[in-house]
């Protein structure tokens, strides 16, 4: 769980299942970051990717985009593929809402995923054989 | 707020807050994908970046690595830089818990964040490759 | 379409302050670095000030260092200069304009005319 | 800071083929894209060449732009003249702190 320090004025601190379950208003601060157009980074990369859509309705947020690589090579300056490099997926954990119940909206449980945000160009790991 | 539909044997789903506040479960789902080892595509990607340790004790997850790329141009075969190209920063939406009361830790408000997760290399030109 | 729409120009007196904005439309904001270009009188084009699409970067011209400030609010879609201590050399139409990378611009706008008199 | 140079001024007549060139002061060409502006009379710059030969869509292959490493210097050429080229034309380069523009050519289709 979460590890708050606990304040021995707040309501059911000493509920033997706290921090198990938390209450969370679902009204989200800087919701105005939503509004923003999605970058067009992944046609003009040197890695350029596809963006997927991953839906679940289960879930919140229900609509997540994962980037998928176009090319095991990056795109050279004449538009061709240099596989001396390789383009890989960038990755980061997020926490999402899963429902705990498929009956009850209002209880949560949260999960973390793995997504894939876009891609990068590497220099392979050269091995060096004795 | 999150538009799920309502079950009507499910209790306080007549409430007028709902679903401004749901309970969640802290014991996250799928907290092994934690164990990963953190990849070191920062430092071999031709647009390099440097992880910043972005904490917030009133937040969960209370750190956050962000990425800031390291150059303005890409580091090109040779280790120099090319400023035919621009490393720029892969942005990402994410959904964090932010404490709504200072003191008590079981009240929390979803909040989106941008944060830049990585870096990639642009062209000005797109190259549609066949 | 690419669209830049330039606004808060006007006269003001030497030593004076303006803020310039930007409405950009038609693109992904956010993904291009944007650019301040100014134009005196009859004269030639001069690089002002130059922002990342994230808004981490800044650059300035010589001329303008310490005067100006250039910001960007990504979730309005909108470019901002600040003017600060403005001399009459400040005179000029401001561009800005939409670069495809650093040093590259694309798009631009079709101008506002800042005059700086007493 | 480098500077851009550029003829003031050329001149030549509809049909005909002029080149506008631009020289680097110092620091390689090379190294740095080279772009094109054309400005009419009363109006905001256009890009007409990008990425030292890129032609944005909607400029006519009319247009093309080069790079001589040897002499640090580009060139605009512009073929088979009209009179909607008359125009100011800027080069423009960088680097990594700075952008520059020439002192501009005014080409005038006789």
């Known amino acids: 769980g979460i590890a708050f320090p606990q304040n021995p004025g707040c309501r059911n601190t000493e509920d033997k299942n706290f921090p198990q379950h938390v209450k969370v208003n679902l009204n989200i601060l800087n919701r105005n970051t939503n509004s923003r157009r999605p970058s067009d980074y992944y046609n003009r990369s040197t890695s350029p990717w596809n963006l997927h859509r991953n839906e679940d309705p289960e879930r919140y947020p229900s609509v997540i985009w994962e980037a998928k690589c176009r090319h095991l090579g990056c795109v050279n300056n004449e538009g061709n593929i240099n596989y001396h490099m390789n383009s890989v997926p960038i990755q980061q954990e997020i926490l999402v809402l899963r429902r705990e119940s498929q009956h009850c909206p209002h209880s949560f449980r949260l999960e973390k995923m793995l997504v894939a945000v876009g891609c990068t160009c590497v220099t392979p790991i050269v091995r060096h054989v004795a | 707020g999150i538009a799920f539909p309502q079950n009507p044997g499910c209790r306080n789903t007549e409430d007028k807050n709902f679903p401004q506040h749901v309970k969640v479960n802290l014991n996250i789902l799928n907290r092994n994908t934690n164990s990963r080892r953190p990849s070191d595509y920062y430092n071999r990607s031709t647009s390099p970046w440097n992880l910043h340790r972005n904490e917030d004790p009133e937040r969960y997850p209370s750190v956050i690595w962000e990425a800031k790329c390291r150059h303005l141009g890409c580091v090109n075969n040779e280790g120099n830089i090319n400023y035919h190209m621009n490393s720029v920063p892969i942005q990402q939406e994410i959904l964090v818990l932010r404490r709504e009361s200072q003191h008590c830790p079981h009240s929390f408000r979803l909040e989106k964040m941008l944060v830049a997760v990585g870096c990639t290399c642009v062209t000005p030109i797109v190259r549609h490759v066949a | 379409e690419v669209q830049l729409l330039e606004s808060g120009g006007g006269l003001v007196q030497p030593g004076g302050s303006l803020r310039l904005s930007c409405a950009a439309s038609g693109f992904t904001f956010s993904s291009y670095a944007m650019s301040w270009v100014r134009q005196a009188p009859g004269k030639g084009l001069e690089w002002v000030s130059a922002i990342s699409g994230s808004g981490g970067s800044t650059y300035y011209a010589d001329s303008v260092k310490g005067r100006f400030t250039i910001s960007r609010d990504n979730s309005k879609n909108t470019l901002y200069l600040q003017m600060n201590s403005l001399r009459a050399e400040d005179t000029a139409v401001y561009y800005c304009?939409?670069?495809?990378?650093?040093?590259?611009?694309?798009?631009w706008g079709q101008g506002t005319l800042v005059t700086v008199s007493s | 800071n480098f500077m851009l140079t550029q003829p003031h001024s050329v001149s030549e007549s509809p049909g005909k083929t002029v080149t506008i060139s631009c020289t680097r002061s110092s620091g390689s060409l090379a190294n740095y894209y080279v772009q094109w502006y054309q400005q009419r009379p009363g109006s905001s710059p256009t890009i007409v060449i990008f990425a030292n030969n890129q032609r944005p869509s909607g400029v006519p292959d009319r247009f093309s732009g080069s790079i001589d490493s040897s002499s640090n210097s580009a060139s605009l050429t512009i073929s088979g003249l009209k009179t909607e080229d008359e125009a100011d034309y800027y080069c423009q380069s960088y680097d990594p702190h700075s952008v520059v523009f020439g002192g501009g050519t005014k080409l005038t289709v006789l």
């Open positions: 304009a939409r670069d495809l990378i650093w040093g590259v611009a694309g798009s």
